[in-house]
Amino acid sequence: PEPPTACREKQYLINSQCCSLCQPGQKLVSDCTEFTETECLPCGESEFLDTWNRETHCHQHKYCDPNLGLRVQQKGTSETDTICTCEEGWHCTSEACESCVLHRSCSPGFGVKQIATGVSDTICEPCPVGFFSNVSSAFEKCHPWTSCETKDLVVQQAGTNKTDVVCGPQDRLRA
């Protein structure tokens, strides 16, 4: 018979032969042959593989480094990685939660809508037209553009969400 060019789900092609993949939690020791099945071995302590695979090495569980404010939220198994979270009152810097911050800052162009608490991180909002923020801050709201008119001045440079307007003297008409 013709050697296969594709294999079924949970199989892989090697040496013109379809071999079974190793199940999650196990790594590949040796490929199947015409006469033997694929040989797999369970991952060791602190290791995992989360898919049907042909990996020869299991992945190390993530380390939740207490020096970065991390602690274990869910202990890893042979089929799942460890999930880290931050110590109470701290917030993950990313979805992967690789480090912790007390709270995040709102970038220039954004103001603080709600200051962080122990439970929720800083909530930012874009500065609307007429307001700006030129700093990264965890407490400052968007500031209103300066009103040139109230200073008897005119707008020389328009404001943006990151910059205030620039006021200047009114042009005096020559007699």
């Epitope: 020096n67 970065l68 404010g69 110590e87 911050v101 007390l102 700093v135 801050s137 965890a138």
Partner: nanobody, 116 residues
């Protein structure tokens, strides 16, 4: 590892005053937004006060408004918290925090105990 160093805590009677300091040996505080945060025994972190990098803007939690004053002296590379009219509920470990507020900058804090 660079850490912030808080000092100035101690035992004070209700109605008394204390001035906390936060120093940063090894790096500059100038231009960075700074916070004072506290943790009362058995409680979570409470954000007390903040000051902008320029020193022009400040924030105070409602619980300390009118009693606490945050300030900075960039020439001395130090942040301060002047605490007046202290109450029993101000008892806590006080920490300072520097933008970007990462855990590895976190200091040991300074304990403030308000008791008669």
């Amino acid at each position: 590892e660079v850490q912030l160093l808080e000092s100035g805590g101690g035992l004070v009677q209700p109605g008394g005053s204390l001035r906390l300091s936060c120093a940063a040996p090894g790096f500059t505080l100038a231009g960075y937004e700074m916070w004072w945060v506290r943790q009362a025994p058995g409680k979570g972190l409470e954000r007390v006060s903040a000051i902008s990098g320029s020193g022009g803007s400040t924030y105070y939690a409602d619980s300390v408004k009118g009693r606490f004053t945050i300030s900075r002296d960039d020439s001395k590379n130090t942040l301060y918290l002047q605490m007046n009219s202290l109450r029993a509920e101000d008892t806590a470990v006080y920490y300072c925090a520097k933008e970007p507020y990462s855990f590895d900058y976190w200091g040991q804090g300074t304990l403030v105990t308000v008791s008669s």
